[in-house]
């Protein structure tokens, strides 16, 4: 059990106040987090409260201010990057939102040496991606979808792909699907250890089907937005890989890097690129049926300018019980050999685990084992391997950092985190800097969080880098909710759920229950972190019981749990939900005529089913940008997990799984269905036909959309949606205003 | 500024040797491909060698293989070209420039005279 | 080696004119097409690099178009200034090669 802090004398109560709404808005308890930008072993840069940009020593101590705010405030500047020769730094400004990751900007390099900007072959504007080579300082950027090199900043630029095109041809960067499905990046490039070469992913969305919505503005006419999307079962982007030597890219050009043969035999994806050395490179591909991965190490071939990926150098990496990897396929992690590798995959069991690969993947060595998880690998040093897992205490919402002595034999493990500050610090993350030789912990919760910075040799705590001071200041008069973390065990499956109850929980009273739902394969709700947001304000103000579960699908818990959905999306989840709320009725707490679920996207999707189960369980609900039907959502992130939309494969559950097809269902719950226009993720489409499909029915419902807005209503909209959602539950649940 | 300096040229007896230097300022000189160009009296302008960054590989035209090389003190800032066993029809002015992404001549010097005569 | 002809070899004109020198590579150099400007006595001096894109400081009215083996150096409006001898350079291999050279005299 988690509880925070509690206050238990009177004369301190009579103090203390509830949260409100406004505090949840406006962010009154958001807390922060520091991760210095390392520039070598000892130093990193970090951007000062008044917005100067300081580079740090950890051994000497010592700190300079290397870019002032008012040279920052001159080109209004919100972020840097300091070339790795420290000659110079870009500066980013006008910064345009486009998807999840991607955005563009524009850039003014500044010459630290002579503290001018550099004048006279100035980058064109605006720019989708631009970054300094590991070496020196060139720049890569791309530029309405083509890639051009700068020698030096001054350096007139020279252009390596010449067919970029909007929306056809994307080079260096990602089409929308690859962004936000694939590689989770705004980049597609990357540059070889030393700089020599520059790898790079062509996408063509030329036969890419375009989903085309209205975006309102303020015109007399709307804008139509078309984005090439490949909806399940659609054409795919079509995607090569090349490379270019950037000390002569004239010479031969840009190289393409060969598929494996067993890859390119039908529809693919390429799914990441690792540079090993300079002329050694891995790709990882991943095959449209998404259970087959091979990763491909190749080498350059002096003779020839070409890269050659032998047969005797692709590792593939299979599934037969789901999908390959977790949320994605995991990524390898180089020995100093540069031909062995670490990585994450499912072991025997059926638990994801790092394994030594130093030939093959049959003969692969297990270094972690256990009914827990590996879940990131950090950093490999000549004698250490840093990771993060979930097998502490055995608790799976936990992150602690290990660390395992490779250079000796066998290999010990020791825990960094586990006991630094047990009741805070359950939740970490880390950031290295080169060779490990310092670190810095990131820790999430459950108690305030604060981040601290470490010596990589003896672990030893170095100094305190964000401690969220005036947060803990501001939260000593409000009454917060209490937090526990437990599971329930049924028929032979765990579902962890955490529980957010009122200040003044009472167990032998009875409370209305919220459920907060996600459930998407590989997520994770249940999670030792902090937070103050609107559920602590639903516990903390209007005495609700709210409750998150992970069921079946949710990542971490090993390959039984998660691939118990697969391809049968919207099954087992909502089940699970639904066994959890009966599971809670039970405990004796919850007034069961005042139950609520809610959830946004895949989330959104769930609480429909939830609503619509026809258990009567539910009073009302809240769907937020569902997905409606699979055959609406991208392709790369539904075939995944639900195959392809045909006869010969998976349409009848694509069919049986839409939130319209139990639009009759609806008829005994209060639905507020919500959306925002111009969600380029979560098509509108999706609310659009439960709609439809509830009007048909007849079916009364409430709705409501947000002209203009993504996925992530944001801005205002923000403060619109909670306050709706939250007038909708209290009237739902006869709480008065 | 970009600045290039030759230096070294003269007359020099037909099967003679002759270094030629160019210094080179105002830029990360080891960062940068660099070559050779000549220009023989009245006559066009001609490729010599070419010398790449990091690694210091070489390239020559035919008319000098074997006779020439070419080379590059990075600590130094300065190029040189070593030619040997010179003819008369290596006479020329000699330019040192910066060969930008190995493709482009962005920067030039003076130039040197080189006359081979007996 | 990648021949570079450059045509006309010499020309004459007037101050204001529109000129136009054209230079064709024995094989394909893709947009690896470059120009340069010399007057007597003096070192070449870079116009165009990449086929079109004007050199920093450069005069707008020199532009250059053509990609694969054509390509063409223009100059809008013939200044004083501009007469002297212009050259193309093939720049998709290691071993960079010149056309002969075109003399634009004063008419």
């Known amino acids: 059990i988690v509880l925070r802090p509690s206050r238990v004398h009177n004369s301190e109560e009579n103090t203390m106040r509830a949260l409100t709404l406004k505090d949840i808005l406006n962010g009154t308890f958001s807390y922060k987090t520091f991760f210095p930008n390392w520039i070598s072993g000892q130093e990193y840069l970090h951007q000062s409260a008044d917005n100067n940009i300081v580079l740090y020593n950890i051994e000497t101590g010592q700190s300079y201010t290397i870019l002032s705010n008012r040279t920052m405030k001159s080109v209004n500047a919100s972020n840097y990057g300091l070339s790795p020769d420290r000659q110079f730094v870009y500066l980013e400004s006008d910064y345009s939102k486009l998807w999840r990751y991607s955005y563009t900007a524009t850039y003014y390099i500044y010459d630290l040496s002579n503290g001018e900007f550099v004048r006279g072959n100035e980058l064109p504007r605006p720019i989708q991606y631009l970054c300094w080579s590991p070496v020196g300082s060139k720049l890569a950027y791309v530029y309405q979808n083509n890639i051009y090199l700068k020698q030096r900043p001054g350096d007139p630029p020279f252009q390596i792909t010449f067919n970029g095109r909007e929306n056809k041809i994307f080079n260096g960067i990602p089409d929308w699907v690859y962004e936000e499905e694939m590689l989770a990046t705004k980049y597609a490039l990357w540059w070889s250890p030393n700089g020599k070469f520059l790898a790079y992913a062509e996408f063509n969305d030329t036969d890419i089907p375009v989903i085309a919505y209205s975006y309102y503005g303020d015109e007399q006419y709307p804008r139509t937005i078309n984005i090439p999307y490949p909806k399940a079962g659609a054409k795919n982007p079509v995607v090569r890989i090349f490379i270019i030597d950037t000390t002569y890219p004239a010479y031969v050009g840009p190289q393409e890097v060969p598929v494996p043969a067993m890859i390119a035999s039908s529809d693919y994806y390429f799914s990441w690129l690792t540079w090993v050395t300079d002329e050694r490179v891995c790709l990882q591909w991943l095959k449209r049926v998404q259970n087959v991965s091979v990763l491909s190490i190749c080498d350059f071939r002096e003779d020839w300018q070409t890269w050659d990926c032998p047969k005797t150098q692709e590792h593939i990496e299979e599934s037969r019980t789901g999908w390959a990897g977790g949320f994605f396929v995991s990524t390898p992690v180089f020995s100093y050999d540069a031909i062995s590798y670490y990585k994450i995959f499912s072991d025997k069991d059926g638990y994801k685990h790092i394994h030594y690969i130093k030939d093959t993947v049959e003969n692969a060595i297990q270094i972690t084992s256990g009914k827990w998880e590996a879940i990131n690998i950090f950093r490999v040093t000549q004698d250490s391997l840093f990771y993060s897992s979930n097998e502490f205490e055995e608790y799976p919402g936990r992150r602690n950092i290990y660390r395992i002595s490779i250079g000796s034999y066998p290999p010990s493990k020791k825990c960094v985190t586990c006991h630094l500050r047990k009741e805070r610090c359950q939740y970490y993350t880390a950031s290295f800097s080169d060779y490990a030789k310092y670190y810095a912990l990131v820790c999430y919760g459950p108690g305030i969080p604060i981040s601290t910075l470490h010596d990589g040799r003896t672990d030893q705590e170095i100094k305190i880098l964000e401690e969220n001071k005036e947060l803990e200041n501001a939260l000593k008069n409000i009454q917060l909710p209490k937090e526990e973390i437990k599971k329930l065990e049924v028929d032979e499956i765990t579902l962890w759920y955490k529980m957010i109850l009122p200040p003044q929980f009472d167990r032998s009273k009875k409370y209305p229950l919220l459920i907060q739902v996600y459930g998407g394969p590989c997520s994770q709700s249940v999670r030792s972190v902090f937070a103050v947001n609107w559920i602590s304000y639903l516990a903390s103000k209007e005495g609700m019981v709210i409750a998150l579960v992970d069921g079946r699908g949710t990542a971490f818990q090993g390959d039984k749990l998660l691939y118990a959905v697969y391809r049968k999306l919207g099954v087992y989840e909502v089940e699970d939900q639904i066994t959890a709320v009966r599971k809670f009725i039970e405990m004796g707490f919850i007034d069961e005529k005042r139950i609520a679920i809610w959830g946004w996207s895949y989330g959104g999707y769930v609480s429909s089913l939830a609503l619509a189960s026809g258990t009567g369980l539910f009073k009302c609900g809240i769907a937020v940008a569902p997905v409606s039907s699979w055959e609406y959502y991208a392709s790369v992130y539904t075939e995944r997990f639900m195959g392809l939309p045909t006869k010969d494969d998976n349409l009848e559950h694509y069919k049986n799984s839409t939130v319209m097809a139990r639009a009759e269902y609806f008829r005994n719950v209060d639905y507020l269905l919500i959306h925002g226009t111009a969600d380029d993720n979560v098509h509108f489409q999706n609310s659009a036909q439960i709609a439809k499909a509830l009007v048909n029915a007849q079916v009364d419902f409430q709705a409501m959309w947000y002209s203009d807005q993504n996925h992530g209503l944001s801005g205002l909209s923000t403060n619109h949606l909670y306050t709706h959602m939250t007038h909708f539950l209290k009237q739902c649940f006869s709480l008065s205003d | 500024e970009v600045q290039l300096v030759e230096s070294g040229g003269g007359l020099v007896q037909p099967g003679g040797s002759l270094r030629l230097s160019c210094a080179a300022s105002?830029?990360?000189?080891?960062?940068?491909?660099m070559s050779w160009v000549r220009q023989a009296p009245g006559k066009g302008l001609e490729w010599v060698s070419t010398?790449?960054?990091?690694?210091?590989?070489?390239a020559y035209a035919d008319s000098v293989k074997g006779r020439f090389t070419i080379s590059r003190d990075n600590s130094k800032n300065t190029l040189y070209l070593q030619m040997n066993s010179l003819r008369a029809e290596d006479t020329a002015v000699y330019y040192c420039?910066?060969?930008?992404?190995?493709?482009?001549?962005?920067?030039w010097g003076q130039g040197t005279l080189v006359t081979v005569s007996s | 080696d990648i021949q570079m002809t450059q045509s006309p070899s010499s020309l004459s004109a007037s101050v204001g004119d529109r000129v136009t020198i054209t230079c064709r590579a024995s094989?394909?150099?893709?947009?690896?097409l470059n120009w340069y400007q010399q007057k007597p006595g003096k070192a070449p001096k870079l116009l165009i690099y990449?086929?079109?894109s004007l050199q920093s400081g450069v005069p707008s009215r020199f532009s250059g178009s053509g990609s694969g083996t054509d390509f063409t150096l223009t100059i809008s409006s013939l200044q004083p200034e501009d007469f002297a001898t212009y050259y193309c350079?093939?720049?998709?291999?290691?071993?960079?090669?010149f056309g002969q050279g075109t003399k634009v005299e004063i008419k």
């Open positions: 420039a910066r060969l930008l992404y190995g493709t482009w001549f962005d920067y």
């Open positions: 105002g830029f990360t000189f080891f960062s940068y491909w």
């Open positions: 010398i790449s960054p990091y690694d210091s590989s070489t």
């Open positions: 094989q394909i150099v893709r947009t690896y």
């Open positions: 990449a086929a079109s």
């Open positions: 350079q093939q720049g998709a291999q290691l071993q960079p090669t």
